[in-house]
């Protein structure tokens, strides 16, 4: 679903970024996945889209436009509150539910102008309209009165994952698709790569049959599986080579003999 920027920068106050990493250039990393992400552009003072390769990169990378704005635009939270507090609620909050043309099954949230509340609905995966949010919290912040907003829903603790030292965000809503949460993978001392490389192959929610590859952390190899076209998880690559480049580098051989290249 394309996001259109209709915030006015004039309302956002000082343009010194909130965090030093917001000044970093967009870095797609060396891998070849194609993940729609967002970064803060120091020159335009806006959050913009870029395609992330799936590994490495830097901290100026966000899964959602909203997350980018909240993190890097000074005063954005106040502006969002102002927008949500009544007369200046965005027009798209009043759009009727639209599941879209396609028929995937994706959990989303919309603002219901009759009940004046954000509610869950099923999105088909393409087109639709902008009254369509990945999280209940995001919907409430933008379209409901923020005074009544609870703390963020479904916060995922990532402590069960072994990471490579970088901050790991919850990838269950990556690329604007909300996917079923796989059970958390137990701590794996012999793997220090991307956490999604530990996830099981997930064929997704639709009815297509597309050849994809997933990384099997038990064998240290990438295997073929059938992907149905939507949903699933990030352990999903269009070629074996991309799969290996993204995941193989995290495998520790005999715990001390270095990284398998």
């Amino acid at each position: 679903l394309s996001e259109e920027a209709d915030d006015t920068d004039s309302e956002l106050g000082s343009m010194k970024p909130l965090h030093t990493f917001c000044a970093m250039k967009a870095d797609d990393g060396p891998c070849k996945a194609m993940i729609r992400s967002y970064f803060f552009n120091m020159y335009t003072h806006q959050c913009e889209e870029f395609i992330y390769g799936g590994c490495e990169g830097n901290e100026n990378r966000f899964d959602t436009l909203e997350e980018c704005k909240k993190t890097c635009i000074p005063g954005y939270e106040k502006t969002a509150v102002k927008a949500a507090s009544g007369a200046e609620r965005p027009d798209f909050c009043f759009l009727e539910e639209d599941p879209g043309l396609c028929r995937g099954y994706m959990k989303r949230y919309l603002y219901n102008n009759q009940t004046k509340q954000c509610e869950r609905f099923v999105y088909g995966g393409c087109l639709g309209n902008r009254n369509n949010f990945e999280t209940l919290d995001e919907c409430k912040k933008i379209c409901e009165n923020p005074v009544h907003s609870p703390s963020p829903v479904n916060e995922v603790q990532m402590s069960d994952y072994v990471t490579d030292g970088n901050t790991v965000t919850d990838r269950s809503t990556v690329n604007n698709i909300v996917v079923p949460q796989s059970p958390k993978v137990p701590r794996r001392r012999d793997y220090r790569g991307r956490p999604w490389c530990l996830q099981p192959a997930d064929s997704g929610l639709c009815k297509a049959s597309e050849r994809r590859f997933y990384y099997n952390s038990a064998t240290g190899k990438c295997h073929r599986f059938n992907y149905t076209g939507c949903g699933g998880n990030n352990n999903n690559f269009t070629t074996r080579r991309r799969c290996l480049r993204s995941c193989k580098t995290g495998l520790i051989k005999n715990k001390s003999k270095g990284v398998v290249k």
Partner: antibody, heavy 123, light 112 residues
Amino acid sequence: QVQLQQSGPGLVKPSQTLSLTCAISGDSVSSDSAAWSWIRQSPGRGLEWLGIIYKRSKWYNRYAVSVKSRITINPDTSKNQFSLQLNSVTPEDTAVYYCARWHSDKMWGFDDWGQGTLVTVSS
Amino acid sequence: DIVMTQSPLSLPVTPGEPASISCRSSQSLVFSFGTTFLNWYLQKPGQSPQLLIYKGSNRASGVPDRFSGSGSGTDFTLKISRVEAEDVGVYYCQQYDSYPLTFGQGTKVEIK
């Protein structure tokens, strides 16, 4: 096998209403795994999407901004067909008009097309 | 609106030789996990368009395996590994990332 059969006049006078119908066989206009669209083609503008309708929990429609004030696409469930009405036509609306099915389940594309109807707007 | 730009607009080909058509979008069409909101169609002379490739790289049913689609972000390619006489016509790319749905201006493939 899905088939789309178009019907309607090939000549329309300026300022009048262009009306075309697309009869569906092999699928249902009310199917929740399809959407139904009108697309036109002219030498000057190439392939131009005009609008689409689809039934999920209720009927939805979307129209191109360029024709939004003049277009209506309606389903006729009793005859298993859908229609295009384009009001206040001008010579710029002269084109070959196609109806098409959007496959919502697997392919996510226009996988079946009508035979096309050349509509000329002229007095 | 997302603008789809194809090149070349005309492509003379020799039967048995490969052919390649480029399509560029004015914004990214990648949605998730390599799924791309882009389709390719072929309109043979005197016929309606037919779906060739959906979601960027998947052949529609009945489409010969000499046709393949690839690309990511904003740059996409349709390749014909060995052109046959029946492949002549106009090829169109189409995006469905956002309304309005838009098509490229077409690439006319003809035998030399």
